[in-house]
């Protein structure tokens, strides 16, 4: 009886999660005389196997980051080894799991920002990559400022775009940053995958040194005032 796991030779597509040890067959192809055996070719990577009787299976865990789709061909042969049916395309789509952590491209970033810069205008980007599928939460990154050093009166002078990693001044930062009082800051920034929404997310951390420079226009006005 034909069912979900057996049937005649025809083009088929199967989806299998990466990282899982083989637990069941993929498919049992049924031979129609004069076909007596089956043959598998294509991107098998020595993982996919077909037995002579048509049993298609895989022998070890798949890795989407190595190959996201395996394009295979199955043919039916007669007793003389001549192809009598096929080959037909068999497509194995490897589904993503969260098996890679995001990684910042740099362990330390350096940037400068002029005092009174417009709030929300990026002056520096931090960037992380994740080998997992960006179309799934596994590869969707969430950036966050863990801490700002120094923290003056519990006021955050810097903010980060959670999706892009763009760092800019907050409204308070635009108004209050003063290189004469404190010319340098440090941010500890984390990135999490799973969009930052899961306890099972992976993370990485980087350090950002920021120099605050004087507002030239303000200095210019000040200069003219005294002359």
């Amino acid at each position: 009886q034909e069912g979900k796991f057996s049937g005649p030779l025809k083009p088929m597509t199967f989806s299998i999660y990466e990282g899982q040890e083989p637990s069941q067959i993929i498919f049992q192809f049924k031979a129609n005389p004069p076909a007596v055996t089956f043959e598998l070719t294509g991107e098998t990577d020595n993982i996919f196997v077909i037995e002579r009787e048509g049993l298609l299976y895989y022998n070890r865990a798949l890795d989407r980051e190595t190959r996201s789709t395996h394009n295979l061909q199955v043919a039916a042969l007669d007793a003389n080894g001549i192809i009598v049916e096929g080959p037909v395309p068999i497509t194995i789509k490897v589904k993503d799991i969260n098996d890679n952590r995001p990684t910042f491209l740099q362990s330390k970033y350096e940037g400068s920002v002029r005092q009174n810069s417009r709030p929300g205008k990026p002056f520096l980007y931090v960037n992380a990559t994740d080998l997992d599928d960006p179309a799934t939460p596994n590869g969707q990154l969430y950036y966050q400022i863990v801490i700002q050093l120094p923290m003056i009166n519990n006021v955050m002078y810097f903010q980060i775009n959670n999706k892009t990693g763009a760092i800019s001044l907050t409204r308070e930062g635009s108004q209050e940053l003063n290189p004469a009082k404190n010319p340098s800051y440090n941010l500890v920034i984390s990135v999490k995958d799973m969009g930052g929404q899961s306890e099972n997310s992976f993370s990485d951390t980087t350090s950002v040194d920021i120099i605050v420079t004087e507002n030239i226009w303000k200095a210019h006005k000040h200069h003219h005032h005294h002359h």
């Epitope: 863990v146 923290m151 984390s190």
Partner: antibody, heavy 122, light 107 residues
Framework: EVQLQQSGPELVKPGASIKISCKAS????????LNWVKQSHGKNLEWIGL????????SYNQKFKGKATLTVDKSSSTAYMELLSLTSEDSAVYYC???????????????WGQGTSVTVSS | DIVMTQSPATLSVTPGDRVSLSCRAS??????LHWYQQKSHESPRLLIK???QSMSGIPSRFSGSGSGSDFILSINSVEPEDVGMYYC?????????FGGGTKLEIK
Amino acid sequence: EVQLQQSGPELVKPGASIKISCKASGYSFTGYALNWVKQSHGKNLEWIGLINPYNGGTSYNQKFKGKATLTVDKSSSTAYMELLSLTSEDSAVYYCARWDGNPHYYYAMDYWGQGTSVTVSS
Amino acid sequence: DIVMTQSPATLSVTPGDRVSLSCRASQSISDYLHWYQQKSHESPRLLIKSGSQSMSGIPSRFSGSGSGSDFILSINSVEPEDVGMYYCQNGHSFPLTFGGGTKLEIK
């Protein structure tokens, strides 16, 4: 005077989980990050992670992902570290330590708690 | 991760000696290097931060030097109460890492 007072020693069975506390006093709790450090065999020091009491932001050493969870209670100026699914490898002294708040002194730990000894044994 | 390597593992000295403890980082960490002292049954104590900045209350015989990947903690006249473990810490990038320590003992 800055003080970090940690909870007492723990003797637990393998597979159990515990929560260690670190009560801060003598400074503005939300103004400084708190770190947790593991010391095994009275020697090696390993940084577990940090938490910012101001916003609850955390950074973990990936080696301790799934092993340690850091939280704070601002109302009591207390930081907590939960250690999960303990094994004999987790037997150690655990310290909380405050970061120097000055960006010029990158991530120096200027005040330390007295340590909490955790022994995992059946 | 940045690996911090300390040497020697043990240093046996006579009171009054000048000693140097070495710490090497696996990559350049500028001057983002901190030194801690840990006496028996005590918590670590910050001695030197950012390579050479002494903490207040630390005796002047302790000094730090170095930049990049090689650092030295010097004690210019060792006293008996200086016995204990000395650790260096990478303050440059995450995860923060410590050296394996140097044990200072009196002969």
